[in-house]
Interface confidence: medium
């Protein structure tokens, strides 16, 4: 299977842009755009804190924790109105991700 330049193999993802804003103390805001070429019924998402192709039904229902977006050992919770999710580390530190 030969791919054109810039074309992704099915089932694969790449990070297109990654911007970091560390202007606020003790808080880093990262904005990431991911491009994926997914199998049928899948869509770009996040699994185990990495870009991945996920079940499209998860995106439709906004049940973000169903992507398993957090690292092993963390806990996942939906944000209010399903705008994203939080990953809580064993030490209590919380990483919040919003979807746009």
């Amino acid at each position: 299977q030969f791919l054109k330049e810039g074309q992704l193999a099915a089932g694969t993802c790449e990070i297109v842009t990654l911007d970091r804003d560390s202007s606020q103390p003790r808080r880093t805001i990262a904005r990431q755009t991911v491009k994926c070429s997914c199998f049928p019924g899948q869509i770009a998402g996040t699994t185990r804190a990495r870009p991945a192709c996920v079940d499209a039904r998860i995106i439709k229902t906004k049940q973000w924790c169903d992507m398993l977006p957090c690292l092993e050992g963390e806990g996942c919770d939906l944000l209010i109105n399903r705008s994203g999710w939080t990953c809580t580390q064993p030490g209590g530190r919380i990483k919040t991700t919003t979807v746009s």
Epitope: T47, E72, C76
Partner: antibody, heavy 122, light 108 residues
Amino acid sequence: QSLEESGGRLVTPGTPLTLTCTASGFSLSNYYMGWVRQAPGEGLEWIGIIYASGSTYYASWAKGRFTISKTSTTVDLKMTSLTTEDTATYFCARIDIGVGDYGWAYDRLDLWGQGTLVTVSS
Amino acid sequence: ELDMTQTPPSLSASVGETVRIRCLASEDIYSGISWYQQKPGKPPTLLIYGASNLESGVPPRFSGSGSGTDYTLTIGGVQAEDAATYYCLGGYSYSSITFGAGTNVEIK
């Protein structure tokens, strides 16, 4: 990290039964969980899965008769209209997603309980 | 309904031989296959996931290959402790996921 099934026993046909899988050492909010059964001397048979959110999917033969639900630390398998064909060891398994280098995502049943025996006999 | 045809049902091998177990899916499962080893009276343990990824802690003599509908588990240089039943689990979506019937491996 461990899983332990309980609730298996001898029941008569038609009796409902609920099996419980208790998870220790990890958060159920960050994994899928599945149930698998194995009749004596036979192979493994997939029953169904529960997502982190509580969404469920079942094997076609299990729909309607088997129900999977969960709390923060346990996963239940509720079985109704049991027949002698349902005699088996029932396993719960943790289902993680392994992500490859480029975003390939695959499920891994990476942690299993020891199983609980359900015997259906008149 | 997905069907996973696993062959052979049983085999006998001598220590050091290479053993191959095949699973054929009734439809393309996009490498959505994992392989498990089960010993009598014990739960299964994961060997390979995503067709070819070796689970951590599993000896490198175990390997997986294949794509589309055709997948193989290979044990290169089989050892006495590899005597067990091996199962493939295939499926592309959770509403259609199935175990193969199993292969019983006996070591002579």
